[in-house]
Interface confidence: low
């Protein structure tokens, strides 16, 4: 359709001349020269027109909104308020655009209709383990469509950061903070759907408790005191490791001291204390560590003690080490009594004593015990008599 010139399309320049006719009458002749400025073609004017596609979830049809300021005239398709309605997903439609500010040829706009909006879902792909400091957002295709996927582009804006990806990961964020991300999907560079998400990052890991002191002042006991971490937490876990054994306790968040009981004497304990919070997952704070060695205690009794006669007046005394030494050193003691009189008192590195030159035909009491350098153990007592001399 050719545009009709409007009164403002030409500027009139008039010059008036007067001549005498043969009849003698005066003829007034007016010469008018029209100057028309050149208009662009509509194809040129609307070369870079953009389109937004609006989706109707009920009808599952699109409306194409032409981003023009003028009320253009559409051919081939009906435009209402610069919108083309009832477009089917993934089908091409053609619309010609004209306006009285431009000349032929019209702009022929191919509407490459995008896939249905419900076929895309903005998905929070944040790993729960990392949800305290990261956000992940991802567009998912949840149904098939016939459009060319290569023509689909994605855009995210989170604060002042812009990403042209289907999936974004924001890292090194603050725990317990709200972040807003806007996203849109474009098909052939035409926006057809958008979504916004406000995501609050999860509770962060608690800080490390500060151990004030950690010590043992007895053989079976230890104590640890601490200051709690600054950040939110639910409880503490206290682990204590003895050699290869590990025991862990769950402690109330209000505790700042714990007394360890029933410890093994003269044993090094490695303690590790961390706070934790149960958020999207349980988050453990950094562990504070300390060590102590419990005090010595009396060793347990030697066992499997035997007394055997090696000759008329000699005895061989043996025993097995105590199950619990409970101290730094290793020494075995043997006391030999006749009646209430101590007749021998020997000390060896091993529990292997040869007692010679005893009285014949005498009842002896043999007491064997272990000494760990700090404490003696309970004696193992056996009675044995020497025989009459065979000679």
């Amino acid at each position: 359709q050719s545009p009709t010139p409007s009164p403002t399309d030409a500027y009139l320049n008039a010059s008036e001349t007067t001549t005498l006719s043969p009849s003698g009458s005066a003829v007034i002749s007016t010469t008018t020269i029209a100057t028309t400025p050149s208009k662009p073609t509509c194809d040129e004017k609307y070369a870079n027109i953009t389109v937004d596609y609006l989706y109707n979830k009920e009808t599952k049809l699109f409306t194409a909104k032409l981003n023009v300021n003028e009320n253009v005239e559409c051919g081939n398709n009906t435009c209402t308020n610069n919108e083309v309605h009832n477009l089917t997903e993934c089908k091409n439609a053609s619309v010609s655009i004209s306006h009285n500010s431009c000349t032929a040829p019209d702009k022929t706009l191919i509407l490459d209709v995008p896939p249905g909006v419900e076929k895309f879902q903005l998905h929070d792909c944040t790993q729960v383990e990392k949800a305290d400091t990261t956000i992940c957002l991802k567009w998912k295709n949840i149904e098939t469509f016939t459009c060319d996927t290569q023509n689909i582009t994605y855009r995210f804006q989170c604060g002042n950061m812009i990403f042209d990806n289907k999936e974004i990961k924001l890292e090194n964020l603050e725990p317990e903070h709200e972040y807003k991300c806007d996203s849109e999907i474009l098909y052939n560079n035409h926006k057809f759907t958008n979504a916004s998400k406000i995501i609050k990052t999860d509770f962060g890991s608690p800080g490390e408790p500060q151990i004030i002191f950690c010590r043992s002042e007895a053989a079976h006991q230890g104590v640890i005191t601490w200051n709690p971490p600054q950040r939110s937490f639910h409880n503490f876990t206290l682990c204590y490791i003895k050699e290869t054994e590990k025991d862990c306790l769950n402690l109330d968040k209000n505790l700042i001291k714990y007394d360890l009981q029933n410890l093994k004497p003269y044993t090094k304990y490695v303690l590790s204390l961390h706070a934790y919070i149960i958020a999207k997952v349980q988050r453990n704070g950094s562990a504070a560590m300390c060590h102590f060695t419990t005090k010595s205690a009396p060793p347990s009794q030697v066992w499997n003690m035997t007394v055997s006669m090696t000759s008329d007046n000699s005895m061989h005394v043996k025993c097995r080490p105590p199950r619990d030494r409970n101290g730094p050193h290793e020494r075995y003691h043997l006391e030999v009594e006749a009646g209430n009189t101590l007749v021998r008192n020997e000390s060896h590195k091993n529990c292997d004593f040869r007692v010679k030159d005893l009285q014949y035909s005498t009842d002896y009491t043999f007491k064997a015990y272990f000494h760990n350098g700090d404490y003696p153990g309970e004696p193992f007592i056996l009675h044995h008599s020497t025989s009459y001399n065979s000679k």
Partner: antibody, heavy 119, light 106 residues
Amino acid sequence: EVQLVESGGDRVQPGRSLTLSCVTSGFTFNNYWMTWIRQVPGKGLEWVASISSSGGSIYYPDSVKGRFTISRDNAKNTLYLQMNSLRSEDTATYYCARDERWAGAMDAWGQGTSVTVSS
Amino acid sequence: DIQMTQSPPVLSASVGDRVTLSCKASQNINKNLDWYQQKHGEAPKLLIYETNNLQTGIPSRFSGSGSGTDYTLTISSLQPEDVATYYCYQHNSRFTFGSGTKLEIK
């Protein structure tokens, strides 16, 4: 005789990964905590990672946390250090050591393996 | 994290001298401190564990003492073979080495 032999050191570019191994013999590996220590040539010792005998407790300094992973295979008597996102400041000789008193007193050390991170 | 400060960085002494090396922790480390000796081109060697316990096979001229935040390694009579760098190492709360003291013979 207690022996610790490190291997896996190499020259790598920044951002790349490397895994060090420490094969041990002459002692009951699964009774001991193990530690990785590193030393920049001409500089001091820096603790890198420690792991308990069962592997249930692991500790790292902030300088490697999130990038390095210590692990052990008690069946193979072997200690590992997986190093990701390597930086030039990770260039050092890496030693593995046995902690004689569970979490301290490193009484046996390997000979070290050299890691160079450079573009 | 706990910081360990060793002083002096370099120490020159004569054979037979009594030598004292210092190590200061930024907080109480409850005597959980070891001393290591490293000779040039060698792996470190454990000398003293838990402040004052002499490791098996280490000469008795080496001794350790201290508590709280202040610790000392003493060599009662310096020998030529003691030329090395000495490191303290805390294992009370995570782990930290000191920066080392280089011991030289005058």
